[in-house]
């Protein structure tokens, strides 16, 4: 909501999760792994990479089925705590200028840092309009105090807020699982909010920094190349 059409393939780590239709976003973090939101879980997912217009075959797409879909063991569907999911692709993505991985964070998100949020979610706060072309939004990371004040009692240490307390610009339905990137690192995963782009109701995002070890351990445990000592 309140964003702009991204330059074509300017978000090369952005993926679309498809089950006959786009239902969530995700981020490519290695040639064979995608991270998304826990509440995007489905038993069958096709991962679509290199997309810009999801309704048109433009020639840069790679469609790869999910081989493994692993939700965080402590995911809570009621509170959306630990809202993170890993998808192993059935075959590695071909990395090129339009499809490439995003780095995991080396430090937690800092208040005031500019970030890029992207997705094919709803662009209306009152109503629904699902775009064909990838939308981008530049938004600041909010302080944990502002975040907790916006959603008293609902924000865990695994969540943070990004956006504008005045409303008007936000992620929305269909954006879940998609990236929040600051300084070339995947800091957040689109998770939840009260409505979209409402005043004093900024978007809430999964804090990827808290899951770097889980991500690395899960990838290692699900690799065909285990090294037993």
């Amino acid at each position: 909501v309140g964003g702009y059409i991204c330059e074509e393939n300017s978000v090369p780590y952005q993926v679309s999760l498809n089950s006959g239709y786009h239902f969530c976003g995700g981020s490519l973090i290695s040639e064979q792994w995608v991270v998304s939101a826990g509440h995007c879980y489905k038993s069958r997912i096709q991962v679509r990479l290199g997309e810009h217009n999801i309704e048109v075959l433009e020639g840069n797409e790679q469609f790869i089925n999910a081989a493994k879909i692993i939700r965080h063991p402590k995911y809570n569907s009621r509170t959306l705590d630990n809202d993170i999911l890993l998808i192993k692709l059935s075959s590695p993505a071909v990395i090129n200028s339009r499809v490439s991985a995003i780095s995991l964070p080396t430090a937690p998100p800092a208040a005031g840092t500019e970030s890029l949020i992207s997705g094919w979610g709803n662009t209306l706060s009152s109503g629904a309009d699902y775009p064909d072309e990838l939308q981008c939004l530049d938004a600041p990371v909010l302080s944990q105090a502002e975040c907790e004040a916006s959603y008293p009692g609902k924000i865990t240490n695994n969540m943070f807020c990004v956006g504008f307390l005045e409303g008007g610009k936000d992620s929305c339905q269909g954006d879940a699982g998609g990236p929040v990137v600051s300084n070339g690192e995947l800091q957040g995963i689109v998770s939840w909010g009260y409505g979209c782009a409402q005043k004093n109701r900024p978007g809430v995002y999964t804090k990827v920094y808290n899951y770097v070890d889980w991500i690395k351990d899960t990838i290692a445990a699900n690799s065909h190349h285990h090294h037993h000592h």
Epitope: A128, D175, G195, Q198
Partner: antibody, heavy 127, light 108 residues
Framework: QVQLVQSGAEVKKPGASVKVSCKAS????????MHWVRQAPGQGLEWMGA????????AYAQKFQGRVTMTRDTSISTAYMELSRLRSDDTAVYYC????????????????????WGQGTMVTVSS | EIVMTQSPATLSVSPGERATLSCRAS??????LAWYQQKPGQAPRLLIY???TRATGIPARFSGSGSGTEFTLTISSLQSEDFAVYYC??????????FGGGTKVEIK
């Protein structure tokens, strides 16, 4: 149980206004969008607009823009639809309908629908 | 505006037979399509949402399928209480939120 109870039938003169109420019970009123749909005698369903009971934000069908006003009173869990400058072709049954799925949801693409409807309010416009 | 077109306008079926109702959208609505049943003098009742998910309390003889622009409501074995008007509705792009014109299922 979850229900929507609408105000009673109205008979109005052309040019007048009508205000229909829809009282919600059995759920958190501010968690669900409320829509208004009308049905002229022997005709299909026609969407008029919607209100977000939490923020008061509205969205109206272009056809009714400038003639319809949707409001809510959260203290009594009631939504209102006022239609002004009534004409004879506004004669219809007016329904309020709740959208299933609470407002505080994850941001996955979610299918929506009207899971609960009011009983309808017949509005007759006649000189 | 997304235009929803239902066919046929009237469907004559004998009790116990299968009924297949069609709904076409003028552009893709993903899976955001609902089906309602309406009987004379009553408010509509939700049958199917998300194109294929049965609403609470709806019998298994009602099923929905399709995505994008083509959708189908199937009633596997018509009961006497199923004779009614059926409407499809898209929730993918609004305002305006749009309904199909309805299909009347009548006794043959």
């Amino acid at each position: 149980q979850v229900q929507l109870v609408q105000s009673g039938a109205e008979v109005k003169k052309p040019g007048a206004s009508v205000k229909v109420s829809c009282k919600a019970s059995g759920y958190t009123f501010t968690d669900h969008y409320m829509h208004w749909v009308r049905q002229a005698p022997g005709q299909g369903l026609e969407w008029m607009g919607a209100i977000n009971p939490s923020s008061g934000g509205t969205a109206y069908a272009q056809k009714f823009q400038g003639r319809v006003t949707m409001t809510r009173d959260t203290s009594i869990s009631t939504a209102y639809m006022e239609l002004s400058r009534l004409r004879s072709d506004d004669t219809a049954v007016y329904y309020c309908a709740r959208v299933g799925g609470a407002a505080r949801v994850g941001k996955a693409y979610t299918a929506s629908a009207f899971d609960i409807w009011g009983q309808g309010t017949m509005v007759t416009v006649s000189s | 505006e997304i235009v929803m077109t239902q066919s046929p306008a009237t469907l004559s079926v004998s009790p116990g037979e299968r009924a297949t109702l069609s709904c076409r959208a003028s552009q893709s609505v993903g899976s955001n399509l609902a089906w309602y049943q309406q009987k004379p003098g009553q408010a509509p009742r939700l049958l199917i949402y998300g194109a294929s998910t049965r609403a609470t309390g709806i019998p298994a003889r009602f099923s929905g399928s399709g995505s994008g622009t083509e959708f189908t409501l199937t009633i596997s074995s018509l009961q006497s209480e199923d004779f009614a008007v059926y409407y499809c509705q898209q929730f993918h792009n609004w305002p305006p939120l749009t309904f199909g014109g309805g299909t009347k299922v009548e006794i043959k």
